[in-house]
């Protein structure tokens, strides 16, 4: 049985496996998926007090 929700992670830390461009790692599914399948936090308005985190689930560089 597939493990539970350990996923929805960003690329702030090294993913367990690299993804090709235009793909992002879904740690729950344990594989790379199209980045458009994963939803990121709402962008903060300009001048927000909290710095915008790097949560875009961008492809591995």
């Amino acid at each position: 049985m597939r493990r539970g929700p350990r996923s929805l992670r960003g690329r702030d830390a090294p993913a367990p496996t690299p993804c090709v461009p235009a793909e992002c790692f879904d740690l729950l599914a344990r594989h790379c998926v199209a980045c458009g399948l994963l939803r990121t936090p709402r962008p903060k308005p300009a001048g927000a007090s909290s710095p915008a985190p790097r949560t875009a689930l961008q492809p591995q560089e």
């Epitope: 350990r6 960003g10 830390a13 993913a15 939803r39 936090p41 709402r42």
Partner: antibody, heavy 117, light 111 residues
């Protein structure tokens, strides 16, 4: 903006099956994760499970084999089925969707369920 | 399951003062250098509202009076200064390990 709306019965008898619908607008349920959460009288919150972009489901083990989450992508709806309900299932049921880290930033307004004979 | 223990259970704070709510996890909720801890506010008749995610990141549209800190097993939500509109129940939630779990809640009141 994503909007979620729960619908279903407000009263179910013990041993019956609860069926709830979450209707989603503003995003497709073929992306992201789509959760069910409930809040019991006394304010305890419980994560019940989800269905994700690929149709993969996860269920809280506390619900054993009583729970099923399904979806209809053509209607952009997902569903909760909870079998053999008891009075302990009396709660407010929410559908919600999380962003990157599992933090749920969009919620339905909730539907209150009473299980009573 | 990871158990989240919130303290205090209830809290009365004067307007304009600081409110501090603690959430302790039974095991670390850190993974890949990220703390998978989030904070919500819930008012009667409303769904929970996300305030803070990833321990310290302010959700879009949430006032900077709200802040979060911590890592590993010990986390804190701070509201400074407290306003009348902040009367609510506050919950922590972890998404580090399945199943996701919530703290028992802290009820904030105005003194």
């Amino acid at each position: 903006e994503v909007q979620l709306q729960e619908s279903g019965p407000s009263l179910v008898k013990p041993s019956q099956t609860l069926s709830l619908t979450c209707s989603v607008t503003g995003d497709s349920i073929t992306r992201g994760y789509w959760n069910w959460i409930r809040k019991f009288p006394g304010n305890k919150l419980e994560f019940m499970g989800y269905i994700n972009y690929s149709g993969t489901t996860y269920y809280n083990p506390s619900l054993k084999s009583r729970i099923s989450i399904t979806r209809d992508t053509s209607k952009n709806q997902y569903y909760l089925q909870l079998n053999s309900v008891t009075t302990e299932d009396t709660a407010t049921y929410y559908c919600a969707t999380p962003h990157t880290y599992g933090a749920m930033d969009y919620w339905g307004q909730g539907t209150t369920l009473t299980v009573s004979a | 399951d990871i158990v989240l223990t919130q303290s205090p259970v209830s809290l009365a704070v004067s307007l304009g003062q600081r409110a501090t709510i603690s959430c302790r996890a039974s095991e670390s909720v850190d993974d890949y250098g990220i703390s998978f801890m989030h904070w919500y506010q819930q008012k009667p008749g409303q769904p929970p509202k996300l305030l803070i995610y990833r321990a310290s990141d302010l959700e879009s549209g949430i006032p900077a009076r709200f802040s979060g800190s911590g890592s590993g097993t010990d986390f804190t939500l701070t509201i400074n200064p407290v306003e009348t509109d902040d009367v609510a129940i506050y919950y922590c939630q972890q998404t580090s390990k399945d199943p996701w779990t919530f703290g028992g809640g802290t009820k904030l009141e105005i003194k």
